[in-house]
C-alpha cells in the first residue's frame, strides 16, 4: 500500500513537468530506493541542480524568458566548483548569458533568483566589468585568463545557460 501511494505521488509529480520536459533522467540518491533525483533529458546535473546550454541567440531578457518557460532561470553561479562544472559543456568561441545583471547601470549587480551578490565569489575577467551601458553578464573564454565573466550590452544576442533545482520524486 505504501509503495502504491508513493508511485501515485511520483506519477502526479512527473505529470507536472511533462509539458516542457517529456523525458527525465533520474538517479537514485543515496541508499534509499525511495529517493530519486531527476533532471530533464538532456540537461546535465551537478549537486542539487540541473543545467541546460541554450544555443539559440537571444538578448538577455529573452534568454531569461526562455529559461523560465522551462521552469528554470538563467544560471546563478555560487561557487568555483559550480563554474568549473559548467565550463566543461561550453564552447570556447561562444559567450553565454548568466543570470546576473545591473539594471540601473549603477554597478549594483543582482542575480535573477535574488541570491545576494557576493564580490568575493565572482569570476570577472581582469578589468571587467568596465562599461555602464553593459548591464548584463556573460561567461566567455579568453586565452590569457581562461573562462571568466564580462559585462555586455543586454540586447546583444548570445547563447545562455539555464539552471533549475533537481526534481525529486
Amino acid at each position: 500500500n505504501f509503495m502504491y501511494s508513493k508511485t501515485v505521488k511520483r506519477l502526479s509529480k512527473l505529470r507536472e513537468y511533462q509539458q516542457y520536459h517529456p523525458s527525465l533522467t533520474c538517479v537514485m540518491e543515496g541508499k534509499d530506493i525511495e529517493d530519486w533525483s531527476c533532471c530533464p533529458t538532456p540537461w546535465t546535473s551537478f549537486q542539487s541542480s540541473c543545467y541546460f546550454i541554450s544555443t539559440g541567440m537571444q538578448s538577455w531578457t529573452k534568454s531569461q524568458k526562455n529559461c523560465s518557460v522551462m521552469g528554470a532561470d538563467l544560471v546563478v553561479i555560487n561557487t568555483r566548483e559550480e563554474q568549473d562544472f559548467i565550463i566543461q559543456n561550453l564552447k570556447r568561441n561562444s559567450s553565454y548569458f548568466l543570470g546576473l545583471s545591473d539594471p540601473g547601470g549603477r554597478r549594483h549587480w543582482q542575480w535573477v533568483d535574488q541570491t545576494p551578490y557576493n564580490e568575493n565569489v565572482t569570476f570577472w575577467h581582469s578589468g571587467e566589468p568596465n562599461n555602464l551601458d553593459e548591464r548584463c553578464a556573460i561567461i566567455n573564454f579568453r586565452s590569457s585568463e581562461e573562462w571568466g565573466w564580462n559585462d555586455i550590452h543586454c540586447h546583444v544576442p548570445q547563447k545562455s545557460i539555464c539552471k533549475m533545482k533537481k526534481i525529486y520524486i
Epitope: 539559440g56 541567440m57 537571444q58 538578448s59 531578457t61 529573452k62 524568458k65 526562455n66 518557460v69 562599461n131 551601458d133 553593459e134 555586455i152 550590452h153 540586447h155 546583444v156 544576442p157
Partner: antibody
Framework: QVQLVQSGAEVKKPGASVKVSCKAS????????IHWVRQAPGQGLEWMGT????????SYNQKFKGRVTMTRDTSTSTVYMELSSLRSEDTAVYYC???????????WGQGTLVTVSS | DIQMTQSPSSLSASVGDRVTITCRAS??????LAWYQQKPGKAPKLLLY???TLAIGVPSRFSGSGSGTDYTLTISSLQPEDFATYYC?????????FGGGTKVEIK
C-alpha cells in the same frame, strides 16, 4: 532628434564588395545596437545582423555569415556594413535601424540602393 | 529559425473599413512581435511592439493582439493615409525574420 543618415546609391559588379555607411546623431551612439535590414526590389524585408557600437560586438544572420562584416567608428558615430562576393540577388535597398530600449527598431535610415550588375 | 507567415499577401478595402492582417510564427515567440507600415520608397515605420503596444505617435485605430504563434494587426477604420504595405517581425531569437508583407490597396 534621432537621425540615421546613410550613404548614397552604389553600382557594383558581381564578385565585388560594397560598404554602406550609417551615420547616427541625436543620441548616445555607443548605447544602442544598430541592425541592418535589406529589401530586394518589390520584395519583403530581410534581417542581416547587428552591431553594438560600444564594443563592436556583432551577431549575423547565418545566411550572410562569411560575406557580411559590420564595423563602427565611434569618433564619427558611424556604422558600416560591408557585403562581399556580390551577386545579382544582392541588388536591394539596405537599411540601418536602431534598436530602442524596448528591443524593437524605433528609428531607420533612409535606405541605400545597391545594384549588382555586369 | 522561426519563420513568419503573413496573410493575406494583399487586400482591397475602402476608407472606413475594418482591416485585419494575421501573422503566424513557426514557433512560440512569446509576444515579441512588431508591426511596421511601409510606403513606396520609404523606410518601414514601427506601429506596434510586444504584439499590442502602440508606438509613440501611432493613431489608436491601429491595434494588435495575439499570443504564442498567432498574431493580428487590426485597423479599425481605414484612412486614406493607411494604404501601404504592412510587415510583422519577431524578436524572439536571431534571425529576427519578417513576414512576407500585406499590401493594402484602395478598392
Amino acid at each position: 532628434q534621432v537621425q540615421l543618415v546613410q550613404s548614397g546609391a552604389e553600382v557594383k559588379k558581381p564578385g565585388a564588395s560594397v560598404k554602406v555607411s550609417c551615420k547616427a546623431s541625436g543620441y548616445t551612439f555607443t548605447s544602442y545596437l544598430i541592425h541592418w535590414v535589406r529589401q530586394a526590389p518589390g520584395q519583403g524585408l530581410e534581417w542581416m545582423g547587428t552591431i553594438y557600437p560600444g564594443r563592436g560586438d556583432t551577431s549575423y544572420n547565418q545566411k550572410f555569415k562569411g560575406r557580411v562584416t559590420m564595423t563602427r567608428d565611434t569618433s564619427t558615430s558611424t556604422v558600416y556594413m560591408e557585403l562581399s562576393s556580390l551577386r545579382s540577388e544582392d541588388t536591394a535597398v539596405y537599411y540601418c535601424a536602431r534598436m530602442g530600449d524596448n528591443e524593437y527598431f524605433d528609428y531607420w535610415g533612409q535606405g541605400t540602393l545597391v545594384t549588382v550588375s555586369s | 529559425d522561426i519563420q513568419m507567415t503573413q496573410s493575406p499577401s494583399s487586400l482591397s478595402a475602402s476608407v472606413g473599413d475594418r482591416v485585419t492582417i494575421t501573422c503566424r510564427a513557426s514557433g512560440n515567440i512569446h509576444n515579441y512581435l512588431a508591426w511596421y507600415q511601409q510606403k513606396p520608397g520609404k523606410a518601414p515605420k514601427l506601429l506596434l511592439y510586444d504584439a499590442e503596444t502602440l508606438a509613440i505617435g501611432v493613431p489608436s485605430r491601429f491595434s494588435g493582439s495575439g499570443s504564442g504563434t498567432d498574431y493580428t494587426l487590426t485597423i479599425s477604420s481605414l484612412q486614406p493615409e493607411d494604404f501601404a504595405t504592412y510587415y510583422c517581425q519577431h524578436f524572439w531569437s536571431t534571425p529576427y525574420t519578417f513576414g512576407g508583407g500585406t499590401k493594402v490597396e484602395i478598392k
